[in-house]
Each structure stands twice: as structure tokens, then as C-alpha cells.
């Protein structure tokens, strides 16, 4: 494949990444596979400047973002290091909450109104952003 | 506009079943929770089930759990209540209802007109 | 359950009056999000219910700005700053937070 050079139509650009902004909502597995068949992941953030951009395109609204408990410890889907990297998570947040009646705790970050994180039950369709980086290789055949 | 058309109600002897459908337009119906609320004569509000956007998932108020299934189909924008066991204190009128907005929003925004179930020997 | 508790029951009302409708839940309805999912409905006459206030003070589109809503946690209060002729009907208060979602019983609202 190819190093991509420039994001592809209706993506945003942004020091160095490309993001996508949805504007309906699906559970976080299927937010995180519709980003994977994209060649990205679900919004990876690892810096406060990352987080004021992001937080700015989606506006108030419930979003979910590319981190998860469903297995034990907090993971980013790319593999960035979460006890080291940068969190933005509301008071008393995350509480793996089980007072929702939907099954379960809450194993999903999400951003809420005014950017924060908060975790939550996986299966609420909320909106989701897909991130991929411009360096990394497409898996697209090289143009000829 | 955003238009809910229930129909399907009627008479039914106790333990019989029905089918409550809800046919949907002016909106995308596959992206959007739909849920059924109902309201027994002269009493309040009361919410029965909800099924999501796709169909994945469905949970339902603990006096129908077991006798009564919401389902969808989204090629042909109609949300349905399969209601077995039919019980006198499930006679009610049969609201249809959408989400507020394509992802979770915790309310309902628009109603059908409802239907009416009599449950009655 | 979250119960949710409606008073008065009902209430009649001067038009051009105030009235004031109280709603308690049993357990708090702040969300994680930073969310309250406290709703309140109108249902008038012979018609299916309608949405006025979402999330505890927003008011749904074209809903008169007579209506407000205010409260945190579990307690909860609609207001209509001066009533008209076409507000009668029942309220009803609504929590989404938790399955089942629940209504209060409903205030039952006249013009004197």
C-alpha cells in the first residue's frame, strides 16, 4: 500500500490525522467496525489540543470515542497507553454504573455536552468519530 | 412531515394474542428508536418497550416481559407489538412513538394517534 | 423501579394565573453525562401526548415560552407563568434515565 497523503472526501484534516464526524448513531462495536472498514479506528485522544478540536465539530451531543473496559483495564483501540496518556473524564467518572436497567456496567467513553468523558453502556446508539493517521499506509493500490 | 399510523387493535378474549403494527414516513425510520407506550381508559401513561434503531436490542416493561415482543422491519418502515396472553388489564389504547433524535435521546418527540385494545370476554 | 410522583393531582386555574405542577422521583435522575432525563408531556383532550420540556428546563420546539421548567436530582417543577384557555389537559413527568422508563400519575389541568 501506499503512504496517504491527503484524507479522503468528507473527512477533516488535522495535525497529521484525518477525522470523520458521523451525524446518526450506532452502538460503540458498531461504531468501532464501521471506523475499521474505513482503514481507521474510533477518535484516538491523546492531547488537550486533540480533545478542543474533536470536541469542537461535534458540538453537545453524546459521541463515542475509541476507548473501552470491556475486557478489564481501560484500552485505546490503537494500542496508545491509557494510564499515561492524557484523560478528560467528568466528576466521578467512570462508575461503571449499573442502575440503567440496559444489562450490565458501563464499559464504553464517550464525550458528553461539554466535551468531558463519561463511560456508558456499549449498546446506546450514540454518534462516533473515526480517526485514521495521514503517515500511516493505505491499504489502497498505489495509483499508477 | 413525521407521520405514526397505528392500527391492528380491537376486541380479544383473555388469552388470545394480537399484532399491533405502526407504519412510519417522513423520516429515515432505520435510524431512530421506536418504542410503544400505552394508557389503560381514564388512567395515565404508561411506557411498555423500546427496540433500537436496527433491531439489536429490545427491553420491555416488567408486566409484558415474557408475554409481548416488539419488533421492526426497516425496508418497509413499520414497528410491531406481537401481544400474547392477553390479560383485561392490557386493555388500553396503543401509542407508537419516536426518538427525539437518531441516537439516544430519552424522549419521545412524536406520537401516532393510537390504537385501541379490549381485552374482554 | 423509579417512582415518580406527581402533586397536585389537579388543578384549576384563573387564565392569565400562574400554576405550578411538582414532580419527585425516587432516585436521582443526573446522569453520568451530566444529563437530568426529567421530561414533561401535555396530553390534551382526545390527543396523544406532546412533548414540551426535555432534559429538565429545555423547552421542545415551538412550545410558548409560558412554560418553564427547573429542578435537580429528584426534585422537579413545571410553571406556567399565566395559563390559557388551550393549556388544559394532563401533565405528565417522565424519567428516562433507567428501564423502565416511568411517568408520574398525571396533574389534570382546568381553567376555572
Known amino acids: 500500500g501506499s503512504e496517504r497523503t491527503c484524507c479522503p472526501v468528507n473527512w477533516v484534516e488535522h495535525e497529521r490525522s484525518c477525522y470523520w464526524f458521523s451525524r446518526s448513531g450506532k452502538a460503540w462495536a458498531d461504531a468501532d467496525n464501521y471506523c475499521r472498514l474505513e482503514d481507521a479506528h474510533l477518535v484516538v485522544v491523546t492531547s488537550w489540543e486533540e480533545q478542543k478540536f474533536v470536541q469542537h465539530h461535534i458540538g453537545p451531543v453524546n459521541t463515542w470515542m475509541g476507548l473501552h473496559d470491556q475486557n478489564g483495564p481501560w484500552k485505546w483501540v490503537d494500542g496508545t497507553d491509557y494510564e499515561t496518556g492524557f484523560k478528560n473524564w467528568r466528576p466521578e467518572q467512570p462508575d461503571d454504573w449499573y442502575g440503567h436497567g440496559l444489562g450490565g456496567g458501563e464499559d464504553c467513553a464517550h464525550f458528553t455536552d461539554d466535551g468531558r468523558w463519561n463511560d456508558d453502556v456499549c449498546q446506546r446508539p450514540y454518534r462516533w468519530v473515526c480517526e485514521t493517521e495521514l503517515d500511516k499506509a493505505s491499504q489502497e493500490p498505489p495509483l499508477l | 412531515q413525521v407521520q405514526l399510523v397505528e392500527s391492528g387493535g380491537g376486541v380479544v378474549q383473555p388469552g388470545r394474542s394480537l399484532r399491533l403494527s405502526c407504519a412510519a414516513s417522513g423520516f429515515t425510520f432505520s435510524n431512530y428508536g421506536m418504542h410503544w407506550v400505552r394508557q389503560a381508559p381514564g388512567k395515565g401513561l404508561e411506557w411498555v418497550a423500546i427496540i433500537w434503531y436496527d433491531g439489536t436490542n429490545k427491553y420491555y416493561t416488567d408486566s409484558v416481559k415474557g408475554r409481548f415482543t416488539i419488533s421492526r422491519d426497516n425496508s418497509k418502515n413499520t414497528l410491531y407489538l406481537q401481544m400474547n396472553s392477553l390479560r383485561a388489564e392490557d386493555t388500553a389504547v396503543y401509542y407508537c412513538a419516536r426518538e427525539g433524535h437518531d441516537f439516544w435521546s430519552g424522549f419521545f418527540c412524536y406520537w401516532g394517534q393510537g390504537t385501541l385494545v379490549t381485552v374482554s370476554s | 423501579d423509579i417512582v415518580m410522583t406527581q402533586t397536585p393531582l389537579s388543578l384549576s386555574v384563573t387564565p392569565g394565573q400562574p400554576a405550578s405542577i411538582s414532580c419527585k422521583s425516587s432516585?436521582?435522575?443526573?446522569?453520568?453525562?451530566?444529563?437530568?432525563?426529567l421530561y414533561w408531556y401535555l396530553q390534551k383532550p382526545g390527543q396523544p401526548p406532546q412533548l414540551l420540556i426535555y432534559?429538565?428546563?429545555n423547552r421542545f420546539s415551538g412550545v410558548p415560552d409560558r412554560f418553564s421548567g427547573s429542578g435537580s436530582g429528584t426534585d422537579f417543577t413545571l410553571k406556567i407563568s399565566r395559563v390559557e384557555a388551550e393549556d388544559v389537559g394532563v401533565y405528565y413527568c417522565?424519567?428516562?434515565?433507567?428501564?423502565?422508563?416511568?411517568f408520574g400519575q398525571g396533574t389534570k389541568v382546568e381553567i376555572k
Open positions: 417522565m424519567q428516562s434515565i433507567q428501564i423502565p422508563w416511568t
Open positions: 432534559e429538565v428546563s
Open positions: 432516585q436521582s435522575l443526573l446522569h453520568g453525562d451530566g444529563k437530568t432525563y
